[in-house]
Each structure stands twice: as structure tokens, then as C-alpha cells.
Interface confidence: low
């Protein structure tokens, strides 16, 4: 069964910067990746970035840079707005559309006790079944 993993890191050198890493574990080719925060895409979440393997990437503030790391994983750098640190306890979700499997989505957040720059990869928690 395909799975999506999500890892959120606070940058050690820049405490207002966060990076979301997402990956797809499964067969098939990725046709689209959507990263949202505050909940799953289209159901309470706010879209931060869309990455298409051929058409390129689109991102919205506070996303700073979205990029492919491998053919099945992406990273998204975020710039926090300041003192309120909204990202610290926010849920980030990554949705991978894969052909022919369908869509798979998982969410993750910064571990509450994590030191800057350190974050153990969480166990994937699928939020939605295949669309």
C-alpha cells in the first residue's frame, strides 16, 4: 500500500525558518504534490505550494521555496512571520497524486520537544484514503 511521510524541521541557524519534507513510498509516477497547512488540502487547510513534475511549482506566502528533492520527495521552506511562531504547533499536510494509484495524503508537525534542527522522521499517518 502506498504511504506518504511528512517531516517538519526548525532550522538550527534561523529559528523563524521551517522546512517541511514529504515523500511518497509506493509504485507509480507522481503527477502532482500539494502542500497545505492547518489541515488537509481542500478541507480546512490552506494551500502553501503545488509541485508538478513537468509544469513546475507554484507557492504562496509564507512559503519561501518549494523544490523536488528526488522523483518522489519534496521540500518546502517556510518563513515564519515572527514572535507568535504559528508554525510551531501547526499541522502540515502533503498530498501526492500518483498514477495509477490515486491520491494519498499524510500530515505531520514539529515534534513539541524537538531542538532546533533536530526532528526524528515520524511514522506516516495517512489522513485520507486514495481519492
Amino acid at each position: 500500500t502506498p504511504e506518504v511521510w511528512v517531516q517538519v524541521q526548525m532550522e538550527a541557524t534561523e529559528l523563524s525558518s521551517f522546512t517541511v519534507h514529504c515523500g511518497f513510498l509506493g509504485p507509480g509516477s507522481i503527477s502532482l504534490v500539494t502542500v497545505s497547512w492547518g489541515g488537509p488540502d481542500g478541507a480546512g487547510g490552506t494551500k502553501l505550494a503545488v509541485l508538478h513534475p513537468e509544469l513546475g511549482t507554484r507557492q504562496w506566502a509564507p512559503a519561501r521555496q518549494a523544490r523536488w528533492e528526488t522523483q518522489s520527495s519534496i521540500s518546502l521552506a517556510l518563513e515564519d512571520s515572527g514572535a507568535s511562531s504559528p508554525f510551531a504547533n501547526t499541522t502540515f499536510c502533503c498530498k501526492f497524486a500518483s498514477f495509477p494509484e490515486g491520491s494519498w495524503e499524510s500530515c505531520g508537525s514539529l515534534p513539541p520537544s524537538s531542538d532546533p534542527g533536530l526532528s526524528a522522521p515520524p511514522t506516516p499517518v495517512p489522513i485520507l484514503r486514495a481519492d
Partner: antibody, heavy 119, light 106 residues
Framework: EVKLVESGGGLVQPGGSLKLSCAVS????????MSWVRQTPEKRLELVAK????????NYPDTVKGRFTLSRDNVKNTLYLQMSSLKSEDTAIYYC????????????WGQGTSVTVSS | DIQMTQSPASLSASVGETVIITCRAS??????LAWYQQKQGKSPHLLVY???TLVEGVPSRFSGSGSATQFSLKINSLQPEDFGTYYC????????FGGGTKLEIK
Amino acid sequence: EVKLVESGGGLVQPGGSLKLSCAVSGFTFSSYTMSWVRQTPEKRLELVAKISNSGGSTNYPDTVKGRFTLSRDNVKNTLYLQMSSLKSEDTAIYYCTRYSWDVYAMDYWGQGTSVTVSS
Amino acid sequence: DIQMTQSPASLSASVGETVIITCRASENIYSYLAWYQQKQGKSPHLLVYNAETLVEGVPSRFSGSGSATQFSLKINSLQPEDFGTYYCQHHYGDPTFGGGTKLEIK
């Protein structure tokens, strides 16, 4: 042409139930998040429910959580809003809206259906 | 929830005038803001999204601006069809709407 046509509104007593429907045409229904927005007699707008394109995930504000249930039939191209334990403050015009993932806003609205909760 | 405060609640203007409607968010919403127009007896329709992007087909006399917590909708050279009620809406998490601004003919 995109069309959203609501039905099912009417007069209901407090504590009663009502089911609204929204028949959709002119776009690939199964590709879009859909939502219901209501407009109170004071003309305030409030999002009451949102559902993902597959129907697998829904979202409600606290004002209606536990009382309203949003569902969709992607074969019939229809959106449903089951409302129960209705209160007088639920009196409003209810609009079915398409929630565009591209602009993250409601880019198409139906004509609305009126719900009056009164004894 | 993020609160959206619109001002003024109502205003009167003449055809040909320029008007500005403002919307303030209770916290930083970056550029996640939309504007809608509603005419009497009709449903709202989307004018502007992402704070400043005009929906295709919306006349260029409309313009949106702002970011973070302060936003505005400017209508240059008002036309008779521009009168109605305008709403802002944030889409930063769970969306909420402003209270509306009723634009009337003077």
C-alpha cells in the same frame, strides 16, 4: 457554463431537520472542494461546511459542528447538507459554492435557498 | 478564529468617483484575502483573490492591495453597476468574512 442550483429550503420549527441539495453542472464536480455559505438576515456571511473533492474529508465551524452533515455524490453531481437540531440562529439564505483550489476562494455560487427556523 | 473588520459599513458615492473599502485582519494573513461583490437579491461573486489578483472578466477599474493585516479594494470611476455590497474574506485556514460594506448611489 458552471451552474449550482440549490433546493430543499423552507420553514422548519426549532429542533427540526432539513436537507439541502445542490445540483451541479458545467465542470468536473469530482475535482473540486465544495462548500456551503450562509447569509444571515443581518447580511453576514458564514462558511458552514466544506468537503474535499473525494468526499473523504469535511470541515465545520463550531456553530454547526455535530448538527450539520455535509456529503456529496460524485456520480449524481450533487452536494447535500443535512441540518438537524435547527435553531433560530440558523435562519439564513444558504448558498452552495465551488471552492477553487487554484484561487482558494469561492469562485462560483448558486442562487441560494432560504431556511427559516421559527415556531 | 481570525476576525475580519471592514470599513466603512456603508458609503454613498456618485458615478465617476473613486472609492476605497478597507479590511483589517485580527492577525497576519499574508496575502490570503478575497473580495466579493453582491448586488441586491443576487448571490455574491468573486472579484479579487490573493489580495490583488483580479478574476478574469472583472473590469480594471477594480484593484485590490495590501498584505499581512491591512487590505483595501479600490474602485476607480464608479459605474452604475458597481453599487452593491462588498465583502472581504480571508482564506488562511478556516475562512471568515468581513461584515460587508454597502456602496450606495449618492
